[in-house]
């Protein structure tokens, strides 16, 4: 299953399959997730080691048993790959690292006014993988405001150095935020020239394209079909690059298919997995296990659940079958692709779905009246769980926020439905940033069921929580995916990085905002909060957040939206925007429904609604 916990001051011994430099443990974990053999990783921050060569070292590891011995190492961080973790699988990494220079091949330099502008330039350059920016206070005046665009053979820095007044980060192309745009077409009977960066075997051109999309240096590809004239080259997928970023030439060639990486697509990237099953094909590789199962789909599920399995063949040969069950061969290779593809067999083959980010139809947990005042504009995909709850009567308007917690589930505040309990009048918009982008053609979800907490009473602040079951499940994308829920009764975690988001009023007597706003707000203890609200009872099922001096807060229109906190690199839904005295007033924190206190209720309702377990626990 999915294991998300990180181990502080621990280092996994042995099992190394690759090493690289990464700026933090989260990026190291992402590289492990996308590496075909990596199950575990260990990361050495600069503070953890004197050996300059090993600082920022990210060590990717494999293990036949799925685990390795941990040794104590002060400062080291270790953890698991996020394979099998559904919507948490993403190659998108937005963080900017201050005081760090990520080294690589510098191929472009320009003057820009901010690190965000530098990141944008990198994202809009086809070859840029990461960048460094010298701030206005950099010690050498001639380098100030320099934006260096970089690449490397492996897509990660060739070295990382601690350097004051330098900020570094990665291209946001994997976040589907590139302005370049992409070529979706594939071209039959056409071969591209230029430099081959890798060669793998694939059953079709789509798999070849997806592998190209997630390969750090592939910009385009040529695939030799199973009817290519040279038998030894059939099903070969050549991943390619060029100095210019486009093929320098193409040659008409029967039984080849060529195309482009989709990494530069805006708003949508292909999933990093291949779910099609190929009849009449045998995928060769190292044998991991053989099991008898009923049907090719069960074989694929078996492969997906066995974390080291990369691909499978389900044999229908009479000698491989007993009654209704046949042999399911679970296999792997060094690069994650079959070492041999044979046609004309009595079987079907396919890939593990361990990197699919759709996951199962569940809400996400982890084991371990009121817009934003004083906030700033959010960017695309920054808060992909945020939804807008809108009511269409004669006109249509935004009333509340909400949080996507599963393919078919939204969590919001009960008071949003005060006086409007009819599910037919509601429209739920997900994967949006600007309310003005919503037109009559914009897709929306309708409500199948509104489940208001049984103890909620109108005009009282208690139990202000409601679940919405959508009529149809939503697909997950970089712009539309769920927020993980805290563990039941989560009181031990100290959250220091919390944010509230919404389209609500920017001042008490304001109006709904167009662009989704965000504000960083510290949590306040319930004791402190109770002092500020002596006329109300602040219960243990509430959580408060705000600045003593005011100025930043949620407000009308943000109700039901998320209070999220980042802990160990993972966002969790800590609160639901509920109520407060005015907006952003001095010494009047916002009050939020404490989600951890309602985990039993959420689990009960999401499970009983359609009779099957809807919860998935990454840990």
């Amino acid at each position: 299953g999915c294991l998300t916990q990180l181990y502080e001051n621990a280092f996994f011994r042995g099992g190394d399959v690759a090493s690289m430099y990464t700026p933090n443990a989260q990026y190291c974990q992402m590289r492990c997730t996308f590496h075909p053999r990596c199950l575990l990783f260990s990361f050495l921050p600069a503070s953890s080691i004197n050996d300059m060569e090993k600082r920022f070292g990210c060590f990717l590891k494999d293990s036949v048993t799925g685990t390795l011995p941990k040794v104590h190492r002060t400062g080291a961080v270790s953890g698991h790959s996020l394979k099998q973790c559904g919507h948490q699988i993403s190659a998108c990494h937005r963080d900017i690292y201050k005081g760090v220079d990520m080294r690589g091949v510098n191929f472009n330099v320009s003057k820009v006014s901010s690190v965000e502008e530098c990141q944008k330039r990198c994202t809009s350059n086809i070859r840029c993988q990461f960048f460094s920016y010298a701030t206005q206070t950099f010690h050498k005046a001639e380098y100030r405001n320099n934006c260096l665009l970089k690449y490397s053979p492996g897509g990660t820095p060739t070295a990382i150095k601690v350097l004051s007044n330098v900020e570094s980060g990665f291209s946001l192309k994997p976040c589907a935020l590139s302005e370049i745009g992409c070529h979706m077409n594939i071209f039959q009977h056409l071969a591209f020239s230029d430099v081959d960066v890798a060669r793998v075997l694939t059953p079709d051109a789509f798999v070849c394209r997806t592998i190209c999309t997630y390969h750090p240096n592939c910009l385009f590809f040529t695939f030799y079909t199973n009817v290519w004239k040279i038998e030894s080259q059939r099903n070969v997928c050549l991943l390619k690059t060029s100095e210019s970023g486009t093929p320098s030439s193409s040659t008409p060639q029967e039984n080849t298919i060529s195309g482009y990486s989709l990494l530069t697509c805006k708003r949508t990237l292909p999933e990093p997995c291949h779910s099609k099953i190929y009849p009449g094909v045998d995928f060769g590789g190292e044998e991991l296990n053989v099991t008898f199962v009923k049907g090719v789909n069960v074989c694929q599920e078996t492969c997906t659940k066995m974390i080291r399995c990369q691909f499978f063949t389900y044999s229908l040969l009479p000698e491989d079958c007993k009654e209704e069950k046949c042999k399911c061969f679970l296999r792997l290779s060094m690069d994650g692709s079959p070492t041999r593809i044979a046609y004309g067999t009595q079987g079907s083959s396919g890939y593990s779905l361990r990197l699919c980010n759709t996951g199962d139809n569940s809400v996400c947990t982890t084991k371990t009246s009121t817009r934003i005042v004083g906030g700033t504009n959010s960017s695309w995909g920054e808060w992909p769980w945020q939804v807008s709850l809108q009511v269409k009567l004669t006109a249509q308007r935004h009333l509340c926020g909400g949080s996507l917690i599963g393919h078919q589930w939204v969590l919001t505040a009960a008071h949003c439905f005060d006086g409007l309990p009819l599910q037919d009048v509601w429209r739920i918009y997900s994967g949006i940033l600007n309310l003005s982008d919503i037109t009559k053609d914009t897709p929306f979800s309708q409500i199948k069921e509104i489940i208001i907490h049984q103890n909620y009473k109108v005009s009282e602040g208690n139990h202000d929580i409601a679940l919405i079951k959508l009529q149809a499940p939503l697909n997950y994308t970089e712009f539309q995916k769920p927020i993980c829920l805290p563990s039941k009764g989560d009181t031990s975690t100290i959250y220091t990085n919390c944010w509230v988001t919404g389209w609500g009023f920017s001042k008490e007597k304001g109006e709904i905002q167009n662009i989704l706003q965000k504000v960083n707000i510290p949590l306040v203890t319930n004791e402190e909060c109770q002092k500020r609200y002596q006329d109300y009872k602040i219960t243990q099922r509430m959580v408060c957040a705000g600045y003593k001096e005011g100025g930043k807060d949620a407000c009308k229109g943000d109700s039901g939206g998320p209070l999220v906190c980042k802990h160990n690199g993972m966002w969790r839904l800590v609160g639901i925007t509920s109520w407060g005295e005015g907006c952003a007033r001095r010494e009047q924190p916002g009050v939020y429904t404490k989600v951890a206190e309602y985990m039993d209720w959420i689990l009960e309702k999401t499970q009983s609604s359609d009779g099957k377990a809807q919860m998935q626990s990454p840990a």
Epitope: P203, F206, N226, N235
Partner: antibody, heavy 120, light 108 residues
Framework: EVQLLESGGGLVQPGGSLRLSCAAS????????MTWVRQAPGKGLEWVSV????????DYADSVKGRFTISRDNSKNTLYLQMNSLRAEDTAMYYC?????????????WGQGTMVTVSS | DIQMTQSPSSLSASVGDRVTITCRAS??????LNWYQQKPGKAPKLLIY???SLQSGVPSRFSGSGSGTDFTLTISSLQPEDFATYYC??????????FGQGTKLEIK
């Protein structure tokens, strides 16, 4: 010239049998998956059966499973459809088609079709 | 099995018009979608493969787009020879290869 030519259609009584043939020319036949698609008069296209390269793997639409058998003779560049226990609802124009290479599975070459009429 | 639903089922348009036909899959089929044109008494002809790629010899006024569950076939400027029935077909979950029910494009 790349082409497919069907034959073997005709009038048959319910419960009877027919064998359709599809002769391929102008391309190397053996590495391609081949399919049969039918179209009842005034209706849409319905996929009937597929046979993958080398003939090792076949599959059928539920409506014909157990009654129809697809086969190929790569030495003769010919595809066959053996139809048994025919029913009135099997009346249709039957087309053979080539599936483009490596599981894109677009049917890029079609025959002109052969008509099968099942009637008493 | 995956169901393919085309809309509209019939459509009247004039020469020079821009025409769009949509096809929706009952579940995600990635880009494994093909479009065919069929004229009365003739075999179908492949127009678009892999959702958006133009088959060799097909005029560039035909284009396809979409991925996942929603796809469109667009004819940018309708010509007299384009009046026909159009079918979408998925090749993702195979077999069976399922076709849409067809869209008949008629002269207004």
């Amino acid at each position: 010239e790349v082409q497919l030519l069907e034959s073997g259609g005709g009038l048959v009584q319910p419960g009877g049998s027919l064998r359709l043939s599809c002769a391929a020319s102008g391309f190397t036949f053996s590495p391609y998956a081949m399919t049969w698609v039918r179209q009842a008069p005034g209706k849409g296209l319905e996929w009937v059966s597929v046979i993958y390269p080398s003939g090792g793997f076949t599959d059928y639409a539920d409506s014909v499973k157990g009654r129809f058998t697809i086969s190929r003779d790569n030495s003769k560049n010919t595809l066959y459809l053996q139809m048994n226990s025919l029913r009135a609802e099997d009346t249709a124009m039957y087309y053979c088609a080539r599936a483009s290479g490596s599981y894109l599975d677009a049917f890029d070459i079609w025959g002109q079709g052969t008509m099968v009429t099942v009637s008493s | 099995d995956i169901q393919m639903t085309q809309s509209p089922s019939s459509l009247s348009a004039s020469v020079g018009d821009r025409v769009t036909i949509t096809c929706r899959a009952s579940q995600s089929i990635s880009s494994y979608l093909n479009w065919y044109q069929q004229k009365p008494g003739k075999a179908p002809k492949l127009l678009i493969y892999a959702a958006s790629s133009l088959q060799s010899g097909v005029p560039s006024r035909f284009s396809g787009s979409g991925s996942g569950t929603d796809f469109t076939l667009t004819i940018s400027s309708l010509q007299p020879e384009d009046f026909a029935t159009y079918y979408c077909q998925q090749s993702y979950s195979t077999p069976p290869y399922t076709f849409g029910q067809g869209t008949k494009l008629e002269i207004k």
